[in-house]
């Protein structure tokens, strides 16, 4: 898991991507249920090899998370090819892993 | 405990249109994505297509685009498959379920569609 | 659409006897998923991703296999086994295969 700490490594990363999916966590560390998500997040890193995941701290990365439009946490938001093609709030296990295997 | 219980069983005949209900209990269906699956006697299993009760989103394999139609009401919990120009083919039970990555997934019991004039 | 494609279609086995039968994915598929299911029962989730064991499943069960080639192996046979197994992998089209049932010599 790729820890983004600005909006040019963002888009690096979603350029970097090509083809493959990408799953970005926004969080922050006084987010209680994105705490609970984050060794699940991890561990589905792990899992889907050929996924990439970012994690956006969205008090480290306002602009990044500004411009995406987070309105609460945590929020996944799923690129390909540098467009979004899915979005969720909750740490929602079930559903994050039905949507990436949905889409990678 | 987390409970998916269906409708009872149709008998409905050649052309018309049916409705199959999927209440669930122990959980909220706005949490994951609900599935039907089809089964013909003595047959093996079909995924016919899931929704997103959340926003309503649904996909469904190309095989029953057309002849299958999955809702979702929120407020009571429950998933429906609405079944289409009915003919022998539709006889069947279809499922409907929970299918999680998980050590545990779940299903209903079962509701059995038999089309005859 | 990714087939799955079981392998055999039907077997016999004897209590005591060892177990195989595999499923064949048209192409690559990251984790395998299988369920058993009895006459006029609902499927059970059985072995998911891959190998590991849903609960209340015997320890006699196991799952293997990787890419487009996979297997469910059953050390020593039961007579509660008897039952018929669809494989099922759930990508962005999830499908299952037509099934191997399993009865008792």
């Known amino acids: 898991v790729k820890q983004i700490e600005s909006k040019t490594a963002f888009q690096e990363a979603l350029d970097a991507a090509g083809d493959k999916l990408v799953v970005v966590d926004f969080s922050a560390t006084w987010c209680g249920p994105c705490k609970m998500i984050k060794p699940f997040f991890h561990s589905l890193s792990e899992k889907y090899s050929n996924v990439i995941f970012l994690e956006v701290d969205v008090d480290d990365c306002q602009d990044v998370a500004s411009e995406c439009e987070v309105k609460c946490m945590p929020t996944f938001q799923f690129f390909k090819k540098g467009q979004k093609v899915g979005e969720f709030s909750g740490a929602n296990k079930e559903k994050l892993e039905a949507i990436i295997n949905e889409l990678c | 405990e987390v409970q998916l219980q269906q409708s009872g069983a149709e008998l409905v005949k050649p052309g018309a249109s049916v409705k199959l209900s999927c209440t669930a209990s122990g959980f909220n269906i706005k949490d994951t994505f609900m599935h039907w699956v089809k089964q013909r006697p003595e047959q093996g299993l079909e995924w016919i297509g899931r929704i997103d009760p959340a926003n309503g989103n649904t996909k469904y394999d190309p095989k029953f685009q057309g002849k299958a139609t999955i809702t979702a009401d929120t407020s009571s919990n429950t998933a429906y498959l609405q079944l289409s120009s009915l003919t022998s083919e539709d006889t069947a039970v279809y499922y409907c379920?929970?299918?999680?990555?998980?050590?545990?997934?779940?299903w209903g019991q079962g509701t059995s569609v038999t089309v005859s004039s | 659409q990714i087939v799955l494609t079981q392998s055999p279609a039907i077997m016999s086995a004897s209590p005591g006897e060892k177990v195989t039968m595999t499923c064949s994915a048209s192409s690559r598929i990251s984790y395998m998923y299988w369920y058993q299911q009895k006459p006029g029962t609902s499927p059970k989730r059985w072995i998911y991703?891959?190998?590991k064991l849903a609960s209340g499943v015997p320890a006699r069960f196991s799952g293997s296999g990787s890419g487009t080639s996979y297997s469910l192996t059953i050390s020593t046979m039961e007579a509660e086994d008897a039952a018929t197994y669809y494989c099922h992998q759930r990508s962005s089209y999830p499908t299952f295969g037509a099934g191997t049932k399993l009865e008792l010599k």
């Open positions: 991703d891959t190998s």
């Open positions: 379920a929970l299918l999680q990555y998980s050590a545990m997934d779940y």
